[in-house]
């Protein structure tokens, strides 16, 4: 049963429809273009809300910013297949019968193929790095400072354990954050590193996913922190297999 | 795997007040309801309230409302169900269940039971 | 409150037979978003309940499919086919679509 507010809204994600269809009258809350039940008491799993997102208006869409480095969303959005619990399934296709293998956060991981293209396992993602470019400032920002705002922000806002955020560091002006969450280190319950990377990513556009909060205000000592460039950066637990000449490309 | 622990038995006095402990594991402990069920000897099972453990938010029967106070402490994962004034009519055995699973929609049905703690009231 | 009545309250049986435990609840189980929240569970001596079905129908995860639930509204029905003696115990049909949740009053399932 989804944990959603009293006034039957889902406080973690407002792309989905709610209502007292429940047990007792009780609120339920699904997620937009999938219609699955989520839990507004967590964070709303990154396939679902993709799924979400493609459902919307079509001028709602923008498209991830394209890079040349390995594992960076080159692929911008497309409509996902998710497993009955919100998880990417390993083979991602089109419509028109392409198909490719992605990671748990689903990026792709190989070259593209046909229908009979196998992805045996949904591999995880064990360490991302979000990599950011804050605007100019009076100063730089005192790094222990920063490091404690950002890790309060992972810790609050986003509700991962605080051992999942592995480092933060700073050269003016960009600022790295390390996430670290192997299969063995994540329990039940545990926020996935992928799912709270994507509403950072989301929150730093100003696209936050939140019910009825107003935007991220990020400070530090008073002083806005106000990102101008993200790169976010996915390592596997398993490498990617891409052909040699997407590697030299 | 899925696990509610309850203790297996409780002897209390007349008048006195006894809290039940469920501790639930392997779970997101948040995103799922807490029923609680009591069972008399040789008797049927009713049902006496519910807790959404992410909120504290509850749901008595009404039979049981001046009786039971449902609580929950989110950091140790554990359900509470405190039985004020009692009297023979409550020796029974409590069950914590938890109610069904986000995403295969067995909303509103008790997919994972306690063993149940056997509360005897004598002097 | 929803009175949910079960019939028989006793069913011997034999190994090998075919059974139904009819559940009649006193105002439909169906809410005005089309749910019904019926649900049966299985409880054996010295055990826990068990899930069986959800949602008139549905099998729960590791439950034979010789378990079959039917109905709609008022009226319900879990059959059981090909009895095994796993299969003995109390049998309960249970109501969430109303305030409070309540219980059939159980059918006990014996050899005969």
């Known amino acids: 049963h989804t944990a959603a507010q009293d006034n039957c809204t889902c406080p973690t994600n407002k792309m989905t429809v709610c209502s007292p269809d429940g047990p007792g009258g009780r609120c339920q809350c699904r997620a937009l273009g999938s219609g699955m039940a989520v839990d507004c008491s967590t964070l709303t799993s990154k396939c679902l809300l993709l799924k979400a997102r493609m459902s919307a208006p079509k001028n709602a869409r923008t498209l991830v910013r394209p890079s040349e480095h390995a594992l960076v969303d080159n692929d911008g959005l497309y409509d996902p297949d998710c497993d009955p619990e919100g998880r990417f399934k390993a083979r991602q296709c089109n419509q028109t019968s392409v198909c490719w293998c992605v990671n748990s956060v689903g990026v792709r991981r190989t070259d593209k193929g046909d229908l009979s293209l196998r992805c045996d396992e949904l591999v995880r993602t064990h360490h991302i790095l979000i990599d950011l470019r804050h605007r100019p400032t009076a100063g730089a920002f005192n790094h222990s400072d920063l490091d404690a705002e950002l890790r309060r922000l992972f810790r609050e806002r986003y509700r991962l354990h605080p051992k999942f955020v592995a480092a933060v560091h700073y050269e003016q002006p960009t600022i790295q954050i390390e996430l670290r969450q192997n299969t063995s280190q994540k329990a039940a319950g545990d926020v996935d590193i992928g799912d709270a990377a994507y509403y950072f990513e989301r929150d730093i556009k100003g696209e936050s996913l939140f019910q009825g909060r107003g935007g991220l205000d990020l400070r530090v000592r008073g002083e806005p922190l106000q990102v101008e460039r993200t790169l976010i950066y996915y390592l596997d637990e398993i490498p990617p297999k891409f052909s040699m000449k997407r590697l030299t490309a | 795997q899925v696990q509610l622990q309850q203790p297996g038995a409780e002897l209390v006095k007349p008048g006195s007040s006894v809290k039940l402990s469920c501790k639930a594991s392997?779970?997101?402990?948040?995103?799922?309801?807490m029923y609680w069920v009591k069972q008399r000897p040789g008797q049927g099972l009713e049902w006496i309230g519910e807790?959404?453990?992410?909120?504290?938010?509850?749901n008595y029967n009404e039979k049981f409302k001046s009786k039971a106070t449902l609580t929950v402490d989110k950091s140790s994962s554990t359900a509470y169900m405190q039985f004020s004034s009692l009297t023979s009519e409550d020796s029974a055995v409590y069950y914590c269940t938890r109610e069904g699973h986000n995403y295969d929609g067995s909303l509103g049905a008790m997919d994972h039971w306690g063993q149940g703690t056997s509360v005897t009231v004598s002097s | 409150d929803v009175v949910v009545t079960q019939t028989p309250l006793s069913l011997p049986v034999s190994f090998g037979d075919q059974v139904s435990i009819s559940c009649r609840s006193s105002?439909?189980?169906?809410?005005?978003?089309?749910?019904?929240?019926l649900s049966w569970y299985l409880h054996k001596p010295g055990q826990s309940p068990q899930l069986l079905l959800y949602g008139i129908s549905n099998r729960f995860s590791g439950v034979p499919d010789r378990f079959s639930g039917s109905g709609s509204g008022t009226d319900f029905t879990l059959k059981i086919n090909t009895i095994k003696p796993e299969d003995l115990g109390m049998y309960y049909c249970?109501?969430?679509?109303?305030?409070?949740?309540?219980f059939g009053g159980g059918t006990k399932l014996e050899i005969k």
């Open positions: 105002q439909s189980l169906t809410n005005s978003y089309g749910n019904t929240f």
């Open positions: 807790i959404n453990p992410s909120n504290g938010r509850t």
């Open positions: 392997g779970y997101t402990f948040t995103s799922y309801w």
């Open positions: 249970f109501q969430s679509t109303h305030q409070p949740y309540t």
